[in-house]
C-alpha cells in the first residue's frame, strides 16, 4: 500500500494505491483511492506512467479527457466514472501487455487539495491448475495442468500424509510454449501416488502462486484450487 500526500499550494489530500499484477491478454485494474469531494466537476484524475510522454488517462469535469493520452493506451483505459465521486480513481486497462509493466502515478486534484501516489504494476500470466488422476499411466499417477504462465514458474508437489517429503525424484514437469509464443502451458506428473492422501501441486513465479489440491480415496476424488497474487502491497 502506498499512501501519498499532496504538496505545496493547496492543502494536501491522501491518495492510496495498491501494487498489483496484470494477467496478459485480460483486463487489469490499477487501484487508486482518494479523499472524496462533494462535487464531481471539481475532481481531476491523472494517471501517468514512468517513461511514457503522454498521459495514461485523464478524467476531469465529470468525463474522460483524452487529448493528451499516449498512443499506447488509446482505447484501452477507463475509470469507473460512477465511483469517482466516492473517491475511487482506479483505472481499468484493456488487454494487458508485458510492456504495461512499470511504475504508474495516480495524481488527484480536488477542491480540498492535491495528492499523488505511485503504484508498481507487474505483468505476466497466471492461471489455475487442475489436478487429475492419469488413468492412462501404468501406475497410479497424478497430472497437474495449468494453461498459461509467464515468466516460467517453479512447480512443487506436496502431500498431506508425507509432509516435508521431496517429490522431485518422482515427478516430471514440462513447459510447453503456447501458440502466441509468450505464455506457456505447465504440465507436471507425479508418479507412485497412494490413495487416501491429499496431494498439492504448487505453481509459483514472481507474480502469482497457485495451488491445485486433489484428495484420492477408494470411493471418490475431491479437487480444489486457488490462486494468489504475490505483490499486492498498498502504498
Amino acid at each position: 500500500l502506498i499512501i501519498g500526500f499532496g504538496i505545496s499550494g493547496r492543502h494536501s489530500i491522501t491518495v492510496t494505491t495498491v501494487a498489483s499484477a496484470g494477467n496478459i491478454g485480460e483486463d487489469g485494474i490499477l487501484s487508486c483511492t482518494f479523499e472524496p469531494d462533494i462535487k464531481l466537476s471539481d475532481i481531476v484524475i491523472q494517471w501517468l506512467k514512468e517513461g511514457v510522454l503522454g498521459l495514461v488517462h485523464e478524467f476531469k469535469e465529470g468525463k474522460d479527457e483524452l487529448s493528451e493520452q499516449d498512443e499506447m493506451f488509446r482505447g484501452r483505459t477507463a475509470v469507473f466514472a460512477d465511483q469517482v465521486i466516492v473517491g475511487n480513481a482506479s483505472l481499468r486497462l484493456k488487454n494487458v501487455q508485458l510492456t504495461d509493466a512499470g511504475t504508474y502515478k495516480c495524481y488527484i486534484i480536488t477542491s480540498k487539495g492535491k495528492g499523488n501516489a505511485n503504484l508498481e504494476y507487474k505483468t505476466g500470466a497466471f492461471s489455475m491448475p487442475e489436478v487429475n488422476v492419469d488413468y492412462n499411466a501404468s501406475s497410479e499417477t497424478l497430472r497437474c495442468e495449468a494453461p498459461r504462465w509467464f515468466p516460467q514458474p517453479t512447480v512443487v508437489w506436496a502431500s498431506q500424509v508425507d509432509q516435508g517429503a521431496n517429490f522431485s525424484e518422482v515427478s516430471n514437469t514440462s513447459f510447453e510454449l503456447n501458440s502466441e509464443n509468450v505464455t506457456m502451458k505447465v504440465v507436471s506428473v507425479l508418479y507412485n501416488v497412494t490413495i487416501n492422501n491429499t496431494y498439492s501441486c504448487m505453481i509459483e513465479n514472481d507474480i502469482a502462486k497457485a495451488t491445485g489440491d486433489i484428495k484420492v480415496t477408494e470411493s471418490e476424488i475431491k479437487r480444489r484450487s486457488h490462486l494468489q497474487l504475490l505483490n499486492s502491497k498498498a502504498s
Epitope: 479527457e65 484501452r76 481499468r92 502466441e180
Partner: antibody, heavy 121, light 107 residues
Framework: EVQLVQSGAEVKKPGASVKVSCKAS????????IGWVRQAPGQGLEWIGD????????NYNEKFKGRATLTADKSTSTAYLELSSLRSEDTAVYYC??????????????WGQGTLVTVSS | DIQMTQSPSSLSASVGDRVTITCKAS??????VAWYQQKPGKAPKLLIH???TLQPGIPSRFSGSGSGRDYTLTISSLQPEDFATYYC?????????FGQGTKVEIK
Amino acid sequence: EVQLVQSGAEVKKPGASVKVSCKASGYTFTSYWIGWVRQAPGQGLEWIGDIYPGGGYTNYNEKFKGRATLTADKSTSTAYLELSSLRSEDTAVYYCARLDGSSYRGAMDSWGQGTLVTVSS
Amino acid sequence: DIQMTQSPSSLSASVGDRVTITCKASQGFNKYVAWYQQKPGKAPKLLIHYTSTLQPGIPSRFSGSGSGRDYTLTISSLQPEDFATYYCLQYGNLLYAFGQGTKVEIK
C-alpha cells in the same frame, strides 16, 4: 435508453461517394467509441472502423483505409461514415454501433437500424 | 490482422438440442471475444462479451467459453426464437474482426 438513429437508404452510381449519418441519444456522446459495420446482401458482418467522438481518434480496417472517412459532430451528437469511389460490391447495409466500456474500446452493445446503400449504374 | 474462423457455417437442429459454435483466432491470445445473434432484416444483438459474460436480459441457456485461440458459444437447449445467424467478434486488438457467421436452421 441508448438510441442510434441512422439516415435513410441511398442509391449511388459507381465512382460516387456516400455519407451515412448516425445520431446518438441517451448517453454522453463524447465518452464512447462508435463503430461502423457493413453487411452485403446474404453475407456476413464486416468491421469498417471506429471513432472516439471525444477526440476524433479513429481506427480503420486496412481494406477501407483511404476510402472510408469517419467523423463526429459533438454539437449534434452525430457520427458520420463517408465512403468514396463506390463500386457495386459496396452495396450493403451499413450499421453504426456504440462500443461498450466508455473510453475503453469494448464490444458493440447498441446498434443503429442500418442504412441500405445501393451502388448501381 | 487477426482473422476469426467460425465453424460450422450452418447447422440444422431441433428445439431442445444442445448447439455449439466455435471460433478460432488466427493468432494472439486474449479474452476479448463477443458473440452476436442476428435475425433477417435486423441489426445484430450482443449476447456475450469478454468470452463468457452474458449481457443483461440474455437467457442463461446461452454461454460462452474459451481461451488462447479457441472460443465457443453454446446454446444448452435450443428454443424456437434461437433460429438465427450467430457471429463471433474479436475486439482485443486495434483492428476488430468478425467470424464468417453460423446459420442455425430448423431440422
